[in-house]
Structures are given as structure tokens and as C-alpha cells.
Amino acid sequence: DAHKSEVAHRFKDLGEENFKALVLIAFAQYLQQCPFEDHVKLVNEVTEFAKTCVADESAENCDKSLHTLFGDKLCTVATLRETYGEMADCCAKQEPERNECFLQHKDDNPNLPRLVRPEVDVMCTAFHDNEETFLKKYLYEIARRHPYFYAPELLFFAKRYKAAFTECCQAADKAACLLPKLDELRDEGKASSAKQRLKCASLQKFGERAFKAWAVARLSQRFPKAEFAEVSKLVTDLTKVHTECCHGDLLECADDRADLAKYICENQDSISSKLKECCEKPLLEKSHCIAEVENDEMPADLPSLAADFVESKDVCKNYAEAKDVFLGMFLYEYARRHPDYSVVLLLRLAKTYETTLEKCCAAADPHECYAKVFDEFKPLVEEPQNLIKQNCELFEQLGEYKFQNALLVRYTKKVPQVSTPTLVEVSRNLGKVGSKCCKHPEAKRMPCAEDYLSVVLNQLCVLHEKTPVSDRVTKCCTESLVNRRPCFSALEVDETYVPKEFNAETFTFHADICTLSEKERQIKKQTALVELVKHKPKATKEQLKAVMDDFAAFVEKCCKADDKETCFAEEGKKLVAASQAALGL
């Protein structure tokens, strides 16, 4: 399927609007510090060049790969060395090493100012004055802060962003209309970014086989009526799409994703009965809808798995002849029967089955050796079930904020070397599992909770990888993708940790806390809690609760005071002294 000019091919397939948007996303994800105007200029130059290639595919440089064209363009940025330091060395390399070099320099936690939302009227004016620039700016700001955001999905977010402004800037109460929509987009966007980050980590750190296994399990749960060959085809295509997006090949990725959506909709009958509505939508909505579609009903009267995977005399023959195909079939058959299991649990079961066959298919009595393999699954299934039950009970008892605090204490004691902002961010997200999943019936709790926790723990892993400080985090993050959560769950208090020196400044608060949103105020308090545990890792729950209750009362009291700043200064000193005494600091 070779084209004389790859850039012309993609321009024609995607259309000018999507082409420009995707090139902007690609550039912003690579050069995260570059000003918006510089990126727009680069994108316009690339677009003009693409148009010359559409007109004449044999024109000069039109035969170059997209990596070569884009890389050459990025390397024309004048301030590359000053702004990016050693990333500038990438430009001395040839493709494909140059692109790999750019990928390695993507920063999951770029030093960029927090996005502050302007007043609604200001936003509406900007939207009306120059809609195109306004939307490009949205793509740019999201892409540079989320360098692995799933590009075709970001186009869908931008479309919804545009629709929100189009509708709400004409509404009587613009703010009431717009702000909830923007909050929803922000929260969904963060979730989408984190989910995609896990996919890219899976591909980049654990390889294509790991991603394919994940995809087989998930698609088999979602499309249990589809044949194994059909699921395998979808997995192959989906792997290609995500490999491209994670590798910075955003034009190819978006194009292939559109082809995959088209294929799925053309073959609905052999895939799932739940796709009808999705397939009636326009492209971006269609692809999003398919990605989120509910699980189809399981076929009736599925036979026992034991027949083919334990009792058959051909188990070892089938395994030895095509290991990955046979394991894929096992995973498919198990997953389609268990929409109530998390994908990571299904992958643990498949790994256990694989390990057993590796051992038993070399044994003198293979059948006797693997006869009880399904018995080994029981504790693997029960462990997440029990954990979720316990934590949902705790969540229901405490509510989200206090549940987050319990997790903050738990995780700070496990890995106290991790930076406080990372511990706060990760623990807050871990705590959201309660409101997200505990409301579900038993049959939906585990896939909701454990697969969500995998996404959140991956955030910890990618942030920690940038500046590694804990061997325990490194170990849990790198040893096994599917066992990350059990690995972190199993960590006890780090007895080797030397408590942090007490610093009164850390616990000094000012009147500005009173004007913060409830969320920001919670983060301030949770930051203090983490610091408290770092100073006194052996503090009991009761001690910490007492100090935090005193702290909450102190903030409430001073925020009601006439002279807030004086109150914070004087009462703060008393609180610090009382807390030190209570904790024996």
C-alpha cells in the first residue's frame, strides 16, 4: 500500500482541517515549551508543503517520510538548545533514531503554568473574534500538557469544546450553560489522557505482546459474540493504531482509526449487537462511541472451558504448535465468559495458565501436572474481590475526602520518598475509585475498580520514572504490568525510611487559603497530611486524625476571623506546637 508521497496521501485521507489539527497536536506534544504562535507557523508551513505534494506527488521532498518532514521542521526552531537543552542533540541524528530521541524527551510533567480559566465573557469574546485560533489554542494547550493524549480523540474533544461555546455563548446565562460543560470536558480529558498513557506505557515498556493481550481480554469482554478470528483481527488493527499514536505517528494513527471504525461498522453483525447507535454517528463521535460501547450480552450455553484447556489430550500439542495463538484463545474464551473480572485479573489468570503449561508440557505426566490449574485461579480472583469489598466499605463509611486521606497515609507510609505533589495527586485519584466504582453492583465493581487503579498507578509510575527516588516504586512499576496493583497493595510501611526533618514553614498557612475553591483547599490540607506522615511515619491513624481535625478547625476559625492573616500567624504557631506535642515531634 505504498504511496509516492506519504504526506499527500494523509492530507487527502484526513482533509485539511484534521491534517492541520493533527500536525499541531504532534508538534505541541514534541516541543512542549514552544509558544503557540511558533507552532502555528510551523503547521502552516507543513500544510502548504503538503498541498504542493497533493498537486504533484513527484515534487521535491514529497517522497520523504513524515518523520523526516516533521523532524526537519521541528529542528528549524531557533531556540531549541536554549529551551530544551539536550533534546537539541536529537537533531544531529538520522531517522528513525531522531524520532525515537524526540519521543524519549516527552515530558509527562512539563514545567508549564496551570491553565487558569478566564471569565466566561472573555472566553466568548475570544471565541467569536477568532474561532479558528481559539480552537487551535485549545488543542495546543492540551497537547503540550498531555504529550501522549490520544490525538484522534483530542479532535473529538475539540469538537465538543467548540459545540459548548457555540451553544453557550448565545445563552441567557452563559456561565450556567458553559461552566458545567467545561468541567465535564476537563475531567473526561484528564481521564482520557491517563487511560491513553497506560496504553503507551504498555506498548513502550512491556512490548506489543503485552498490549495485544490487554486488547484481546478487553475486546472479548466487550464483544463476546464475536469469533476469536474476528477479535484477533480487531486486536491487530487496534494495536497498529495505538502503536502509531504512541510513536508520534498521529496522521497514520487517525487515518487507521477511521478505517477501523469503518470496518467495525460494516461488520457489526459478526461483532456486537450494541454498535448500531454508534455507527449512525459522524466519524469522531463514532470512533469515540465504539471505544466506550457497553459489553454485548454473552452467548447462551457457552461450554465449560475445562474441555479444551484442561481435559483435552491435545492441550500441550496445541500450546507447543502456536503458543501465543493458544494462549490468545484461552484469554478470549475466559474473558468473554467474565465481564465481571478486571482485564488485569484476566491477564493474571492467562499468565498463570501459561506458566503452568510451560512447566507441565515438559513434564513426564503433563495431564496430571496441569489437571488442577483452574484451582490456582481461585486465590487470584478472591484477592481483588476482597480488596474491593474492604475499600468500598471504607469509602462508604468515610466519604471521598476522608477516604482519599486514608489512602494518602497508606501510600505515604509505603513510599515516603515520592514527592509530596505526586503522592497527593495519585492518592486523590486512587480515592476517586470509591465514587466511580463502589456504586456499581458486584458484577461491575471489579472491572471498574481494578482497571481504573491500573490507570492511576501508571501515573505514579510515569511520574516516578522521570525522577526515580524509590526502589520499591521502580520494582512495582517495572516487574509486571498486570501485577502493579497487587505489588503496591502488598507494600508495608517502609522501615528503612529516615523521617524528614521538621520544618515549620511547611505547616505555615496564610489567609489566601480562604479564597481557594473547596478542591484547592482539600489539596492544601492533604499536602500537609503527607508532610506530617513524612515527619512521623509511625504516627497512628488516631494521632493523624486528631491533628487533621485540629487543622480543619483552625482553617475554619481563621477564615471567619476579621483579621485573617493575624489569626493564621498566631493560631498557626499554636497549632504547630500542639501537633508536635501530640505526635512527639
Epitope: 500450546y319 510451560e358 501436572c369
Partner: antibody
């Protein structure tokens, strides 16, 4: 590269016991069965049994139950076979061999000669 | 246990001659493996999983068979092929070996 290094020749009295060793290197010792095979002079090969060092599981040829005891130690990556109540019938070369999927033996030790004589 | 009968027990062949030896099982086996042994050395895996050549084995060797009947064939005998060849079955406990076919060069 994979290597199986066996202990040296043994000359022992009838009725006594002997423990021969097979030191493995160059692969993940825990993840492969270690087999023991007997070969008497000028005769064929006879499978004695096997051990999976990862969890200590064993299988024996019924003819050697009570005669041979196979063990393994993961830290020096060594498999052992103890032979008890020795008679002249036990005089043979004993070879360790790594077992792989579908039951073939891809690497063999150099053999340990056992002579049982009064 | 499954008994493997190898035939012939001893055979000789001239260089360039085609050689076939057989291994017959007392009941059906899943896979057959073949080993070459020269005097004073340990056996070497020669053909495994019925028909796959072990690393370093010349392509003039081949293996085939199913059920109870298996064979090892040398397309064109060479002097270095003179050795004893043992078959071994897998799929039934205990694992068993044939008594061997001793191949000599004429």
C-alpha cells in the same frame, strides 16, 4: 551458554548410599525440569525421574521409587540424586539432562560413573 | 509403561547410501525424540518433536511418524553419522527409551 556439570566418579560399598550432583548454569534453572538417566555399560538409556526446581515437583519411573531421591537447590542452581541401598546392579553412568516442552532433553551433563563394589 | 522397539539393532551403510531406522511403540505416543550417542560421550538431542532437527544437525537427517510408528532417515550416509541412535517417547509416564540402533559405516 547452557552447561550441566556433574560431580566426579564414585566407588562405594554395597548397601551404602551416594548423592551425585549436577550444577546448572547459563539458563533459568527454576523454569526447567531436570531429568536423570541411567546407562549401564553397553546398554541402553533408562529414565529415572525428574524435578522442577521452581516448586520442587517430582516424577519418578516406578522402577526407581525407593531407590532414587531427586532434589534441587535453587541458590547454587544444582540438582541432586541420592541412590540408596546400593547393589552391583546400580553400577552405571548417571546423566542429568534438561527437559523442555514436549519432553525432549536438549542439554546433557557429562555423566557420573558409579561403581558399587566390595 | 510404553515399550519402544528399535530396529534393526545394528546396521551398516556405505557412504552416500540412504539409511532408515524405525521405532515402534507398544501403544500410541504423542511425540518421539531421537538422540545420537558416540562411545564415551553423553547422548545429544538429534531430532525432537518427531520431525524437528536439533541445532547443528545436518539437513540430510529427517524424522517422521505418528501413533505407534516412527522413523529416522539419513538421506545420504556419511562417516560422521556412525553412532548409536535412541528413540524416546513423551506423552506417557514413565518416559521410555528404545534399546538403540547401532549404525556403522561400511
Amino acid at each position: 551458554q547452557v552447561q550441566l556439570q556433574q560431580s566426579g566418579a564414585e566407588l562405594v560399598r554395597p548397601g551404602s548410599s551416594v548423592k551425585i550432583s549436577c550444577k546448572a548454569s547459563g539458563y533459568a534453572f527454576s523454569n526447567y525440569w531436570m531429568n536423570w538417566v541411567k546407562q549401564r555399560p553397553g546398554q541402553g538409556l533408562e529414565w529415572i525421574g525428574q524435578i522442577y526446581p521452581g516448586d520442587g515437583d517430582t516424577y519418578y519411573n516406578g522402577r526407581f521409587k525407593g531407590k532414587a531421591t531427586i532434589t534441587a537447590d535453587k541458590s547454587p542452581t544444582t540438582a541432586y540424586m541420592q541412590l540408596s541401598s546400593l547393589t552391583s546392579e546400580d553400577s552405571a553412568v548417571y546423566v542429568c539432562a534438561r527437559g523442555v516442552i514436549l519432553g525432549s532433553f536438549d542439554y546433557w551433563g557429562q555423566g557420573t560413573t558409579l561403581t558399587v563394589s566390595s | 509403561q510404553i515399550v519402544l522397539t528399535q530396529s534393526p539393532a545394528i546396521m551398516s551403510a556405505s557412504p552416500g547410501e540412504k539409511v532408515t531406522m524405525t521405532c515402534s511403540a507398544s501403544s500410541s505416543v504423542s511425540y518421539m525424540h531421537w538422540y545420537q550417542q558416540k562411545s564415551g560421550t553423553s547422548p545429544k538431542r538429534w531430532i525432537y518433536d518427531t520431525s524437528k532437527l536439533a541445532s547443528g544437525v545436518p539437513v540430510r537427517f529427517s524424522g517422521s511418524g505418528s501413533g505407534t510408528s516412527y522413523s529416522l532417515t539419513i538421506r545420504s550416509m556419511e562417516a560422521e553419522d556412525a553412532a548409536t541412535y535412541y528413540c524416546q517417547q513423551w506423552g506417557s509416564n514413565p518416559l521410555t527409551f528404545g534399546a538403540g540402533t547401532k549404525l556403522e559405516i561400511k
